[in-house]
């Protein structure tokens, strides 16, 4: 049915879906606080620009009776139920902020006539790529995949002189929502990562992973996994690891590695950690009592979604353009706006760009050190530490296949 948008005559409303099934188990109160903080800033920015308009948010809660798994498994139906609620109320804002689960976003995008923009904190999966009116404010799987292929191919750095073409991927099904979709993208046989690699096998059992660590007949020295150091320790423990094994630990939304007082445990010496540059938002572990770094990133994406809407609203109002048009709905991409922690860049498809950081453990200091950075916007790697104090022989990353070239 035709739903009227509360989006004109100087009054602009944001519909915020508060879903019980969410990419991260974040109290909805924290998300409300983030949205309200964003609204306060947007109102100030619009006022400073001489635009005397009203901007509000409507929080739409699902009843939570049926869809109460708390994670993303039953989010598809919850998302559609919330859309039905909007339809029944005949009331929609200028923009929809909320669905964070890949399942719900994908289905909602399919099942709605999208003449309005949808902003997501999450929706990490490849199935949410290239959606014309969807903006994603947390790094999607495609960005990770492009980094990995870029890094695998790199062979002209002092610490990486071999191109890699093989990998194991550890994926046991207990991953968080972000990790699930990151690994899913690497596993998919039709993905860019799979296309570019000559050999890739998914390890699904703890024992498979543990056996590979010392298996002389292994087909690759490289293992990709996703999670934090504790997750790795639970799996690997203090087991011996062959000297040319490289574990790539994807832990994007965790800035604990950058804290001054953090020492890398011994089991991390064979590990390269891929995380996001903390930018302006570096927290001391003692700092954020309510929010872990990951959950801050999630709430921050909601806040930045509000600021993004404010940015677009300001541009359209200053140009005297209508907000309830396909042009507005398709405009939330290929731009940079002032986010809460600093500038935020969106690519041509509305996905957030960021600086990824690859860390290693220094054998000298037992600290995490930056090996290289990668700018997702230009798909380019920038070496930082040209003579890293690696655990690997000759302070170089080994070849990905044992016995192929000098080790």
């Amino acid at each position: 049915s035709q739903v009227s948008q509360n989006c004109h005559n100087g009054s602009y409303e944001i519909s915020v879906l508060m879903m019980g099934n969410s990419a991260f188990a974040e109290p909805l109160k924290n998300l409300e606080d983030a949205v309200n903080e964003g609204l306060e800033i947007v109102r100030g920015r619009l006022q400073n620009a001489g635009l005397n308009v009203t901007v509000n948010a409507t929080f739409m809660y699902s009843d939570g009776l049926i869809h109460n798994s708390g994670d993303c498994r039953s989010s598809t139906c919850e998302g559609l139920d919330l859309l039905r609620k909007i339809s029944n109320a005949q009331r929609m804002g200028c923009v929809l902020i909320g669905p964070s689960c890949t399942y719900s976003t994908f289905q909602m995008y399919l099942d709605t006539e999208l003449s309005y923009p949808m902003i997501s904190a999450g929706s990490f999966g490849l199935s949410c790529d290239y959606k014309e009116t969807l903006t994603r404010l947390m790094s999607p799987a495609r960005k990770l995949m492009y980094f990995l292929v870029n890094f695998w191919k790199t062979n002209d750095l002092p610490f990486k002189t071999y191109s890699w073409s093989t990998s194991y991927v550890y994926k046991n099904g207990t991953e968080t929502e972000d990790c699930f979709w990151y690994l899913n993208a690497l596993e998919a046989s039709v993905s860019y990562f799979s296309h570019e690699l000559g050999f890739k096998v998914v390890l699904r059992q703890d024992k498979e992973f543990q056996d590979i660590l010392m298996d002389h007949n292994r087909k690759s020295n490289v293992i990709i996994m996703c999670g934090g150091p504790e997750f790795l320790y639970k799996l690997k423990g203090d087991r011996a690891v062959a000297e040319d094994i490289v574990i790539i630990l994807v832990d994007l939304f965790n800035d604990q590695y950058f804290e001054d007082n953090v020492t890398a445990p011994d089991y991390m010496k064979n590990v390269l950690v891929l995380t996001l540059s903390p930018g302006n938002s570096l927290l001391n572990s003692s700092f954020s009592r309510n929010l872990s770094p990951t959950k801050r990133d999630f709430a921050l994406a909601y806040l930045n979604g509000i600021l993004l809407f404010g940015h677009m609203l300001k541009i359209f109002l200053e140009n005297g353009e209508n907000i309830t048009t396909p042009k507005f709905a398709h405009a939330f991409r290929n731009l940079t706006f002032e986010g809460y922690d600093g500038p935020v860049t969106l690519d041509d498809w509305g996905d957030v760009d960021s600086t990824m950081v690859l860390l290693y453990t220094s054998v000298d200091t037992k600290k995490y050190k930056v090996l290289l950075t990668y700018d997702t916007h230009v798909n380019k790697t920038y070496p930082v530490d040209m003579s890293p104090t690696f655990t690997w022989k000759n302070s170089k990353l080994p070849n990905d296949i044992t016995g192929r070239g000098p080790q």
Partner: nanobody, 115 residues
């Protein structure tokens, strides 16, 4: 340890001025938005003013616009609130808070506007 310590409150007559300070320690002050929040007797919390990490943006609640000025000195890890033309309705406990998470609060400083 992360700490925020407010000072500068007191008793002032209507029309008078006060300057509140907030000293921050234990975190990288220059990376965070800061907010002054107040709580009047028997009322809920109300944000008063906020300032971006680099001082580049400042916003105020309507009731204090033109009277209050928020500022910061990142070199000194300090936040300030200059309050002019004070009114009885500005009587409250004033807190500084950091980040949108509002995780860290000071103990507050009391401002009483009365003749």
């Amino acid at each position: 340890e992360v700490q925020l310590v407010e000072s500068g409150g007191g008793l002032v007559q209507p029309g008078g001025s006060l300057r509140l300070s907030c000293a921050a320690s234990g975190f990288t002050f220059s990376r965070y938005w800061m907010t002054w929040v107040r709580q009047a007797p028997g009322r809920g919390l109300e944000w008063v003013a906020k300032i971006r990490y680099d001082g580049g943006e400042k916003y105020y609640v309507d009731s204090v616009k033109g009277r209050f000025t928020i500022s910061r000195d990142n070199a000194k890890n300090s936040l300030y609130l200059q309050m002019n033309s004070l009114r009885a309705e500005d009587t409250a406990v004033y807190y500084c808070a950091t980040d949108f998470t509002r995780d860290v609060w000071g103990q507050g400083t009391t401002v009483t506007v009365s003749s």
